[in-house]
């Protein structure tokens, strides 16, 4: 679809005569008839196949034709066509004299013709005017013409319809050849595919408008290039969605089980050495002079009563010191300078001479001991604490500090390891002599039933088109991560490419 435009510029008829040579009375009131038709090697009469147009009276005899395109569009003359412009044409321009106001062909005498010109040739679509001048013996006509496409038609022959649009069926303007020119941020054959945020992951991200990056299930981050770990993953990471790969020192399904309590919590005090011994379990090896589960208790070295013969013990920073009673000496007051004559035996002990009176020995009554019967019997010497308990003298009494897993006055009672419900996921706990055992329900295993061994939802290969399958361990379901060009919960649907233009 287009328009053949003819701009009449000047008509010269100096003598004011008709084609017959007869003069017009009082002058030649001139109007034009234009016939546009298909190309003919010799232009002949017949139907004006491309259209006709007539002008009103434009002047008398000789005159210039005013450009009147702004005020009604009579000049240039418009000959619209609704077909593909063929690139060639024939044009007939007739100048007629109008004796009256009726310009219809049937109302005019045949000899009212002033002049007739006929041209033919090639004409390409374009904005530029072609200037031409046709001269006969009595008249001269100067004019220009061109072919332009109608609004929304493009191409060499005005055959391509294109209408700019900016909605969800396209975001484009039209190029001179009728091809689409996408608006910024849009791509595709019809410019209806948005260009996502630069760097947005091709498979894991998508967008519905330009510069956007929306993440597919299992992915996150500005560019959808960070996987989402398993829900509840505490001290772990992922390289593919729904994984939970534990950081060093952590274990379990959610990486929430502390396998390196020593490093994470530093429980051992006073410079003790810490050793990991299982989940949330550790052992402290105390430096000399300290005791307790965490080596938090300072040991008095006098607690073991190292001073003999009634010597009194004094704690010192680097050990202890014995203050010996008269007649004794040595590190532990173990050497005597006494004999039975000095009555060295206390608490009713009886003295016996030794080595010809150079030495002696005391025979102590019950509940007393020591080389001079000076000490009450140490209640701990009989090792009353069972199961490796530590016996501590506390004045007139004694107490047992029990090892983990034991209780009672003498550590004789075994604490049930099962009391704290150590078996996960409904496992059954059994106490053993040196620990416990968990019997796990179906779907779980491990020392504490902490490992899920449920059926792998991906085992049946539910994902199509080489998609990657991930098992969601919390729900025993699967998630398919589609390769580029496929969508759907199983990646079963290809993303169709739009067919080509129907032109």
């Amino acid at each position: 679809s287009g328009v053949f435009q003819l701009q009449l510029q000047e008509f010269i008829n100096e003598r004011g005569v008709l084609a017959s040579g007869r003069p017009c009375e009082p002058g030649c009131r001139t109007f034009f008839r234009v016939c546009l038709k298909h190309f003919q090697a010799v232009v002949s009469p017949g139907p004006c196949t491309f259209g006709t147009v007539s002008t009103p009276v434009l002047g008398t005899n000789s005159f210039a034709v005013r450009d009147d395109s702004s005020g009604g569009g009579r000049n240039p003359l418009q000959l619209p066509f609704n077909f593909t412009w063929p690139g060639t044409f024939s044009l007939i321009i007739e100048a007629w004299h109008a004796p009256g106001d009726d310009l219809r062909p049937e109302a005019l005498p045949p000899d009212a013709l002033i002049s007739k010109i006929a041209i033919q040739g090639s004409l390409a679509v374009g904005q530029n005017w072609l200037l031409d001048e046709q001269t006969s013996t009595l008249t001269r006509l100067r004019y220009s013409y061109r072919v332009i496409c109608s609004d929304n038609y493009y191409g060499d022959n005005c055959s391509r319809l294109c209408k700019k649009r900016n909605d969800h069926f396209g975001h484009y303007v039209c190029q001179p050849d009728g091809n689409l020119s996408c608006l910024p941020g849009w791509t595709g054959e019809y410019c209806q595919q948005p260009i996502c945020l630069s760097g947005c992951h091709e498979q894991n991200g998508y967008c519905s408008k330009p510069a956007e990056c929306l993440c597919r299930p299992g992915w996150q981050g500005r560019l959808c290039n960070e996987c989402i770990p398993h829900n509840g993953c505490r001290h772990g990471t992922c390289s593919t969605p729904w994984q939970c790969t534990c950081d060093e020192g952590w274990g379990g399904l959610f990486c929430d089980q502390d396998l390196n309590y020593c490093t994470h919590h530093s429980p051992c005090k006073n410079g003790a050495t810490c050793s990991n011994s299982g989940q949330r379990s550790y052992t402290c090896t105390c430096r000399p002079g300290y005791t307790g589960v965490d080596c938090e208790l300072e040991l008095s070295e006098c607690d073991s009563n190292p001073c003999r013969n009634g010597g009194s013990c004094k704690d010192q920073e680097d050990g202890y010191h014995c203050l010996c009673p008269p007649g004794y000496y040595g590190l532990h007051c173990e050497h005597s300078t006494l004999s039975c004559a000095d009555s060295p035996c206390f608490n009713g002990g009886s003295c016996r001479e030794r080595n010809q009176g150079a030495n002696y020995a005391c025979e102590c009554p019950p509940n007393f001991t020591g080389s001079n019967c000076e000490k009450k019997v140490d209640r701990c010497t009989s090792n009353p604490c069972a199961n490796g308990g530590q016996c501590l003298n506390r004045g007139p009494s004694r107490m047992c500090r029990c090892r983990p897993g034991f209780t009672g006055t003498y550590c004789e009672l075994h604490v049930s390891d099962c009391a704290r419900n150590p078996c996960a996921h409904g496992g059954t706990c059994h106490d053993l002599e040196n620990g416990l055992m968990c019997t796990c329900p179906a779907g779980f295993s491990g020392r504490r039933c902490e490992v899920r061994t449920s059926i792998d939802a991906c085992a049946s290969s539910p994902c199509f088109n080489r998609a990657t399958c991930y098992t969601d361990l919390s729900t025993d379901t699967f998630v398919c991560n589609c390769p580029y060009g496929f969508v759907g919960s199983r990646c079963e649907f290809p993303v169709g490419l739009p067919p080509s233009f129907p032109w």
Epitope: K163, K164, D167, H168, G488, P494, G496, P499
Partner: antibody, heavy 121, light 104 residues
Framework: EVQLQESGPGLVKPSETLSLTCTVS??????????WGWIRQPPGKGLEWIGD???????YYNPSLKSRVTISVDTSKNQFSLKLSSVTAADTAVYYC?????????????WGQGTLVTVSS | SYELTQPPSVSVSPGQTASITCSGD??????VSWYQQKPGQSPVLVIY???ERPSGIPERFSGSNSGDTATLTISGTQAMDEADYYC?????????FGSGTKVT
Amino acid sequence: EVQLQESGPGLVKPSETLSLTCTVSGGSISSGSYYWGWIRQPPGKGLEWIGDIYYTGSTYYNPSLKSRVTISVDTSKNQFSLKLSSVTAADTAVYYCARQAVMYGGGSDNWGQGTLVTVSS
Amino acid sequence: SYELTQPPSVSVSPGQTASITCSGDSLGDKYVSWYQQKPGQSPVLVIYEDSERPSGIPERFSGSNSGDTATLTISGTQAMDEADYYCQAWDSETGVFGSGTKVT
């Protein structure tokens, strides 16, 4: 050949929500060449465009219905759905689902057979 | 909101030409589709992008669109062409239908 089939209750009470599903067979709803739309026609009256959706989930609604309309897509089931809330008797109509072709400038080249929804207590 | 206006009815004798108009502000700058709907049936696309015919639509259906008016022309009208005809265009992101024309 692609076929569209509407399904859902034929009677809805005033103030309730109208819910319809369109099942696409013979082709993938995930084709990038089409939008999937809903159009309605009250008895004896003309056609009214309700809205449409792309397979990615992008939606477009008639401004006069926007506050009450939700269109969603389920690519795994090859279906798209319409929800229209707070219905009145004026929402009584034959509801059509249709395929709108990008290459046809948005023209609907495939329609379901339509389902009559009556709003009445 | 954007509106498309159609005449309520058009009468035509068999074999003659029927012309249905659709008017809207600067409609020539938009693509127009035309639908035929027979009683009790779903609409059928007969013209898209002003003047293009989908496959299976007879050549007697043609369309044009310029200025403020789009026209659907049925030349050599047949009895089977008796139906309601709707024009449709897109205004921004919204689909707009004409009021419909009954062709008898």
